[in-house]
Interface confidence: low
Amino acid sequence: FKVTTPYSLYVCPEGQNATLTCRILGPVSKGHDVTIYKTWYLSSRGEVQMCKEHRPIRNFTLQHLQHHGSHLKANASHDQPQKHGLELASDHHGNFSITLRNVTPRDSGLYCCLVIELKNHHPEQRFYGSMELQVQAGKGSGSTCMASNEQDSDSITAA
């Protein structure tokens, strides 16, 4: 299988909810010896290898933002991500998403979704998707997020 992103750029006014989506395409291995992990993290833009660097989303690391079935895998030793305006969702068609509620410019960045396939006696396989979130400061709540299939290569000032 592979991971795709329906949109690679989201431009959202401050205060809106941003739902970033990834999709698993193709057959996923099944069986008692197969585990699929789905998670999210922030990374750096302008890298040659996208999604290499791991940064927390609103102080939550990728270990705390794992999808488990259709629900968020809660870690009792940490604050619930929902309390910090983060919600994870997934369906049976391979779509999974993270929603950031009440976004601020500090939420802007390159978001990566990661799917890890663990099979007994097989090497771990990792599949990535990436998308840019840009939050416009001081915009009214009347406008909504816009999603596009473009990468903003323009706002990266090249060396």
């Epitope: 660097e53 500090r106 802007s108 840009q134 473009e150 990468q151 290569s153």
Partner: antibody, heavy 113, light 112 residues
Framework: EVQLVESGGGLVQPGRSLKLSCVAS????????MSWTRQAPGKGLEWVAS????????YYPDSVKGRFTISRDNAQNTLYLQMNSLRSEDTATYYC??????WGQGAMVTVSS | DVVMTQTPPSLSVTIGQSVSISCKSS???????????LHWLLQSSGRSPKRLIY???NLASGVPDRFSGTGSQKDFTLKISRVEAKDLGVYYC?????????FGAGTKLEMK
């Protein structure tokens, strides 16, 4: 060498329309967002419009939203700015820009009766 | 939108003098990748703006090292040491961390 060459400026009456063009060379045009930035006489710089690399999405400040339309022809390496319902406050030099890294020579637009 | 406040609005200098221009933003310009997308442009009389410094302190190609940029977060400075006649013009700070891009109002550098 990156080059951006604007054309289409001129004198126009309030309420009328004008279309600016910008021919780009020296870089892979269809890989980059492009923008228009303007400068009123004796004033500072103001972003006017941006367009994604395939032209799928466009962005405008409130001051021109609904009146200006940015578009592009990637086959011709050309960026456009269609300006409708022009007002005196739209009088400015309009620059075609690649980020803030590269700027065209500018096209002067004067809106006056 | 991010407001860029540039000071002073104008500077009268003599050739060989050193000067500094300040630029303050209404919010932090640090992007999530840790980089700060604050740039300095020069617009000479009757010309288009030209990039001098990108990402706070990096000199653009062909720019002499008499120009230097410093700062972090919301507070930035452009310093020109040993001003030459060709340095005269209007200096702008610009940010591309947040969409839309915004500019300072400019600082006019002129001969005393």
């Amino acid at each position: 060498e990156v080059q951006l060459v604007e054309s289409g400026g001129g004198l126009v009456q309030p309420g009328r329309s004008l279309k600016l063009s910008c021919v780009a060379s020296g870089f892979t045009f269809n890989k980059y967002w492009m923008s228009w930035t303007r400068q009123a006489p004796g004033k500072g710089l103001e972003w006017v419009a941006s367009i994604t690399n395939s032209g799928g999405n466009t962005y405008y400040p409130d001051s021109v939203k609904g009146r200006f339309t940015i578009s592009r022809d990637n086959a011709q390496n050309t960026l456009y700015l269609q300006m409708n319902s022009l007002r005196s406050e739209d009088t400015a030099t309009y620059y075609c820009t690649l980020g803030v890294d590269y700027w065209g020579q500018g096209a002067m637009v004067t809106v006056s009766s | 939108d991010v407001v860029m406040t540039q000071t002073p609005p104008s500077l009268s200098v003599t050739i060989g003098q050193s000067v500094s221009i300040s630029c303050k933003s209404s919010q932090s310009l640090v992007y999530s990748d840790g980089k700060t997308y604050l740039h300095w442009l020069l617009q000479s009389s009757g010309r288009s703006p030209k990039r001098l410094i990108y990402q706070v302190s990096n000199l653009a190609s062909g720019v002499p090292d008499r120009f230097s940029g410093t700062g972090s977060q919301k507070d930035f400075t452009l310093k020109i040491s040993r001003v030459e006649a060709k340095d005269l013009g209007v200096y702008y700070c610009a940010q591309t961390t947040h969409f839309p891009y915004t500019f300072g109002a400019g600082t006019k550098l002129e001969m005393k």
